[in-house]
């Protein structure tokens, strides 16, 4: 069964910067990745970035840079302009569309006790689902 993992980390140098890392564990070929926050894409979540392997990337504030790390993983840098650091309690979700598995999505957030530079373990959360 394919899995999606999500890691959220706070940058050690800049406490207002966060990075979301997502990856797809499965044999398929990724055709699209959607990153959202506040919940899954299309289920209350707000889109932050969309990445296609050839057509490029599209991102929306507060996303700063979305990029492919490997053929099956991406990273999204976020700039927190507010003083109260709302990202700390936010859920980030990544949805991978792949062939032949279809769409798989998982969510993660910054661990409550996170020190700068520490990240959530790369384990999928139970809301993993296929469309």
């Amino acid at each position: 069964t394919p899995e999606v993992w999500v890691q959220v980390q706070m940058e050690a140098t800049e406490l207002s910067s966060f990075t979301v890392h997502c990856g797809f564990l499965g044999p398929g070929s990724i055709s699209l990745v959607t990153v959202s926050w506040g919940g899954p894409d299309g289920a209350g979540g707000t889109k932050l970035a969309v990445l296609h392997p050839e057509l490029g990337t599209r991102q929306w504030a507060p996303a700063r840079q979305a990029r492919w790390e490997t053929q099956s993983s991406i990273s999204l840098a976020l700039e927190d302009s507010g003083a109260s650091s709302p990202f700390a309690n936010t859920t980030f979700c990544c949805k991978f569309a792949s062939f032949p598995e279809g769409s798989w999505e998982s969510c993660g957030s910054l661990p409550p006790s996170s020190d700068p530079g520490l990240s959530a373990p790369p384990t999928p959360v139970p809301i993993l689902r296929a469309d």
């Epitope: 699209l32 969309v50 392997p53 769409s103």
Partner: antibody, heavy 122, light 107 residues
Framework: QVQLVQSGAEVKKPGASVKVSCKAS????????IYWVRQAPGQGLEWMGH????????DYAQKLQGRVTMTTDTSTSTAYMELRSLRSDDTAVYYC???????????????WGQGTLVTVSS | DIQMTQSPSSLSASVGDRVTITCQAS??????LNWYQQKPGKAPKLLIY???SLHTGVPSRFSGSGSGTDFTFTISSLQPEDIATYYC?????????FGGGTKVEIK
């Protein structure tokens, strides 16, 4: 290079069905969608629907719902569009085009197939 | 459905002229708008995507601008090979819709 090649012209009687094929080459078929657009003689362009090659998910124009079926064969990188219960106003050139695997983003059509003329006449 | 109103429906201009075509959406489509060129008997060809991005290999005399509901397509210096019909297309919402087309002729 990226190319879409469509099947040849068809002449059909009212009430019949037609199935047009669109063979893709030069790119990863499952990274994109195939969109179908038709053009009646001397008229503009009309979106008929599309299929996402990675999943087989489809969206169809409301006016064609129930009469149109779009499918893909990923083993041959070929898309198909079947239109049933043909009427004279279905006479048109039918185009397939490569588009995004999500209609919401990156959704420009490039390239297009050469077109397939379907004539519906009794 | 989002209606795309394209104007003019036809125009005649001289070689070297600046040609402008407008497309108005009935609702906000952000910059989800593309422009195509279609020559008689041929399939359409993509010129501009996402309102203002020039597609690879398309001459720089073609350009696009706009956002929201109002969009403009410009040929800065009309060439004989530009004789064609031009269409705008939105993908901000389903169904995907096209403008009615603008036929460009040489005077």
């Amino acid at each position: 290079q990226v190319q879409l090649v469509q099947s040849g012209a068809e002449v059909k009687k009212p009430g019949a069905s037609v199935k047009v094929s669109c063979k893709a080459s030069g790119y990863t078929f499952t990274h994109y969608g195939i969109y179908w657009v038709r053009q009646a003689p001397g008229q503009g362009l009309e979106w008929m629907g599309h299929i996402y090659a990675y999943s087989g998910d489809t969206d169809y124009a409301q006016k064609l719902q129930g009469r149109v079926t779009m499918t893909t064969d990923t083993s041959t990188s070929t898309a198909y569009m079947e239109l049933r219960s043909l009427r004279s106003d279905d006479t048109a050139v039918y185009y397939c085009a490569r588009g995004s695997p999500t209609y919401e983003h990156f959704n420009w059509f490039d390239p297009w197939g050469q077109g397939t003329l379907v004539t519906v006449s009794s | 459905d989002i209606q795309m109103t394209q104007s003019p429906s036809s125009l005649s201009a001289s070689v070297g002229d600046r040609v402008t075509i407008t497309c108005q959406a009935s609702d906000d489509i952000s910059d989800y708008l593309n422009w195509y060129q279609q020559k008689p008997g041929k399939a359409p060809k993509l010129l501009i995507y996402d309102a203002s991005s020039l597609h690879t290999g398309v001459p720089s005399r073609f350009s696009g601008s706009g956002s929201g509901t109002d969009f403009t397509f410009t040929i800065s210096s009309l060439q004989p090979e530009d004789i064609a019909t031009y269409y705008c297309q939105q993908y901000g919402n389903l169904p995907i819709t096209f403008g009615g087309g603008t036929k460009v002729e040489i005077k």
